[in-house]
Interface confidence: low
């Protein structure tokens, strides 16, 4: 069966029907490049006016304008608010009332696209494997990133959160139109990774999405993550304004000037430093969501009533912090270089600025307890990674899970830890799952490109797709079309239950109280220490000549080393910059 032309609010769209085997039978309808909104520079998105005739939705559109990986050029375009849909079909009747999974990509709110990194037309966020294996509809889309998506003066002149509003427009479009594609508009799951995971969290908290979202999955990121909300947007807006020659004293004049500045110039006016700075790298993530009093009306911690009826899966990778540790403490990955106590204390201090010396000392003390018995470099380096993982991912996720559970009415809450080790051969032997390592498994790459993977990788992928799509279908990762390797029990406040996702998932994979000692430290001991200064009061942006991001290690089955500079070609984005 196949859909043919589908009538949407904008007009007819026609995709392609891809047979899953030479013998016919099952297939997937694929629609690429359906416009869901339009937007002017640094303004809120608007509904797309539609089109005449039938839109041929057969090619991915360009990503939203962003810096290349070397941060010395741009690619993508401003006209970028398009979405892609995968609809699984059986042999006889067209599908109807299928669960819908809407993907929000990561990339530090700075980079990324709805199709993800590609190598020889193999796109990371190709929804086919999820759709066909889980019998769900998959939707991916672009949203604005970097200064164009998140620049804010902290007032009504440039409220910011344009990228978040793009995401909302995509979700709302799906709600209004997905029934025509065979989807159930009352069963929408949004899922995302890193900045996309924090976006998922923020979308569930925003009053704008009331009634739109049934379930949500956040992979390595939350609204409560320290890198997810910009508390000092004006500081960064002025930094950009100065670089492009706009006035900075009056926010009205600054906003007016920025809106008519060349979008490429705005994009290139900001560079994320990846050479070690005074503070940890995440402090330099400037253009991220803000509390605008409207889309995000309050501090996210105060908005959890809005998630009372949204089922939630949230989890992290067991070494999510590794990617950031390698920037903040470069010796972590270098076998011939040593990490010193001073290195670690500087890192700790950078993450505990608000609590001053007492905060840094208390944090250093608890994290270095094991160094007395095991002062090896391996243990010290693992501590650095564990610390970054805790601060940036684990603690915010655990707090969010507890908040979700505490405010839940009908909602169910599930937690996981992804522990399948990274396949990067250059990593240390003790390496676990790095930031963004989970993406390839959720999107079924071990099946789509089998030669690049082992049977154990396919086992991980099969399990994750089964749990994820069962959850989308029923709100319970165990119940749906796909058998699962073991029962995943809900998170409870008493036991902090979580599923440890590895190559062999058994009953013993259901665990509880992940890093309880450290969670208690952050939630109790650290929390009660007196606050001495705002998080970023002393932060100074890096100098203009600071080194720009090199290509980080990435999954070599997905990525080629150098992105093409020709803007007409879809450029590659390393999967590991997921954030």
């Amino acid at each position: 069966a196949k859909l043919g032309a589908v009538y949407t609010e904008g007009g007819f769209v026609e995709g392609v029907n891809k047979k899953l085997s030479l013998l016919g039978g099952d297939s997937v309808d694929i629609f690429k490049g359906i416009p869901f909104a339009t937007a002017k520079t640094l303004e809120n998105p608007q509904r797309h006016p539609g089109w005449q005739g039938t839109l041929k939705a057969t090619n991915f559109k360009k990503r939203c304008l962003q810096a290349t990986i070397t941060q010395d050029n741009t690619y993508g375009q401003e006209d970028c608010l398009y979405l892609n849909i995968w609809v699984p079909q059986g042999r006889k009747q067209v599908s109807h009332n299928l669960p819908v999974m809407v993907w929000i990509y990561g990339g530090a709110f700075l980079m990324g696209s709805g199709q993800g990194a590609n190598f020889l037309k193999n796109y990371l966020y190709d929804g086919e494997e999820i759709a066909t294996r889980g019998n769900v509809i998959v939707v991916t889309f672009n949203y604005r990133v970097g200064p164009l998506g998140f620049l804010s003066t902290g007032d009504a002149n440039l409220p910011g959160n344009f990228g978040l509003r793009d995401q909302h427009m995509a979700i709302a479009w799906v709600k209004r139109n997905i029934a025509a594609f065979g989807g159930d508009p009352d069963n929408i799951t949004i899922f995302g990774e890193s900045a996309g995971a924090a976006s998922v969290s923020l979308q569930t908290l925003s009053p704008y999405n009331k009634g739109l979202i049934r379930r949500a999955i956040s992979q390595s990121g939350m609204a409560l993550s320290p890198w997810a909300i910009q508390k000092n947007p004006l500081f960064w807006a002025k930094t950009i304004a100065k670089k492009v020659g706009c006035p900075t004293e009056d926010t009205g004049k600054m906003a007016a000037c920025l809106k008519i500045t060349d979008p490429r110039a705005l994009t290139l006016a900001y560079k994320l430093p990846v050479k070690k700075q005074e503070y940890p790298v995440v402090h330099y993530l400037a253009f991220i969501p803000v509390i605008d009093g409207d889309f995000i009306p309050d501090d996210p911690i105060n908005l959890y009533n809005n998630t009372a009826d949204i089922d939630y899966i949230a989890g992290i990778n067991n070494m999510d912090g590794h990617l950031f540790a390698t920037i903040d403490v470069p010796a972590v990955d270098k076998t011939k270089q040593t990490v010193t106590e001073e290195d670690f204390y500087r890192l700790v201090s950078g993450h505990t600025v608000a609590k001053g010396l007492k905060g840094a000392q208390a944090t250093f003390d608890i994290y270095t307890e094991s160094w007395a018995q095991d002062p090896s470099q391996e243990n010290m380096k693992k501590t650095v990674v564990a610390f970054e993982t805790d601060v940036l991912f684990l603690i915010p996720t655990e707090i969010a899970l507890a908040q979700h559970k505490a405010h839940a009415k009908s909602a169910k809450t599930y937690s996981y830890l992804f522990s399948h080790p990274s396949r990067m051969p250059i990593y240390p032997k003790w390496m676990g799952a790095d930031h963004a390592d989970d993406l390839q498994y959720v999107f079924g790459k071990p099946f789509a490109t089998p030669l690049g993977y082992r049977p154990q990788d396919r086992a991980v992928s099969k399990a994750m797709i089964a749990y994820w799509t069962n959850f989308a279908r029923s709100g319970d990762p165990n119940m749906g079309n796909s058998p699962v390797p073991t029962h995943w029990y809900p998170y409870t406040l008493e036991n902090g239950n979580y599923l440890d996702i590895t190559k062999t998932i058994t009953s013993a994979s259901m665990k509880e109280h992940l890093r309880e000692k450290f969670l208690k430290f952050w939630a109790v001991t650290f929390e009660v220490l007196p606050t001495v200064t705002g998080d970023q009061d002393t932060l100074t942006p890096p100098e203009d000549d600071s080194e720009v991001a090199p290509d980080p290690p990435s999954d070599d089955s997905q990525v080629v080393p150098v992105p093409p500079t020709d803007d007409s070609v879809e450029a590659q984005m390393p999967a590991t910059i997921g954030f």
């Epitope: 009908s410 406040l493 009953s507 013993a508």
Partner: antibody, heavy 119, light 105 residues
């Protein structure tokens, strides 16, 4: 501490219905599933079904489908198990049992309620 | 439904003995739990997830196995251990073994 207190023994005639209650205390009632298990005299344990007190969702063993109804009252932290069309072979001690955690076995049990079906 | 078969059905042993009870599932399972029941009392959770001991259960009890074959071992029988032991699989429709009665020799 966790406590599950069940209602008292019942004697019923064949064809009648019985409703057994299980009052929970010492924990957050809506955070754990509640199961019902029975044990006929001198026999082994038999799982009847489970209820999620949070939303009232139920799952019953195939054998009891159509005859059993599990409900809950969150205001009193009580779950109920009603078995209809009773027959003599339903004579048994009926236990409520709360999920533990992790692999979620039956970690806490009520004291049991003897239901006798006799004409 | 998955059938659970315990062996032996009954067993006589003395205080201090090492005792092993086995449980076989009719098809591969993920979860296996063991319970102890004394006459007139409700069952008590002894081991969960094949090998994990809940707090308060003495360390002389241990469990092992995976797939279809599982074992409960009591390393040194104590007087209070004489009881009936049940295995149970956790799936969408849990089932118990028929029980193993452990008696004093």
């Amino acid at each position: 501490q966790v406590q599950l207190v069940q209602s008292g023994a019942e004697v019923k005639k064949p064809g009648a219905s019985v409703k057994v209650s299980c009052k929970a205390s010492g924990y957050t009632f809506t955070s754990y599933n509640m199961h019902w298990v029975r044990q006929a005299p001198g026999q082994g344990l038999e799982w009847i079904g489970v209820i999620n007190p949070s939303d009232g969702a139920t799952s019953y063993a195939q054998k009891f489908q159509g005859r059993v109804t599990m409900t809950r009252d969150t205001s009193t932290s009580t779950v109920y198990m009603e078995l209809s069309s009773l027959r003599s072979e339903d004579t048994a001690v009926y236990y409520c049992a709360r999920d533990y955690y992790g692999s979620s076995p039956l970690g806490y049990w009520g004291q049991g309620t003897l239901v006798t079906v006799s004409s | 439904d998955i059938q659970m078969t315990q062996s032996p059905s009954s067993l006589s042993a003395s205080v201090g003995d090492r005792v092993t009870i086995t449980c076989r599932a009719s098809s591969s399972i993920s979860y296996l739990n063991w319970y102890q029941q004394k006459p007139g009392k409700a069952p008590k959770l002894l081991i969960y997830a094949a090998s994990r001991l809940p707090s308060g259960v003495p360390s002389r009890f241990s469990g092992s196995g995976s797939g279809t074959d599982f074992t409960l071992t009591i390393s040194s029988l104590q007087p209070e251990d004489f009881a009936t032991y049940y295995c149970q699989q956790r799936s969408s429709s849990p089932t118990f073994g028929q029980g193993t009665k452990l008696e004093i020799k």
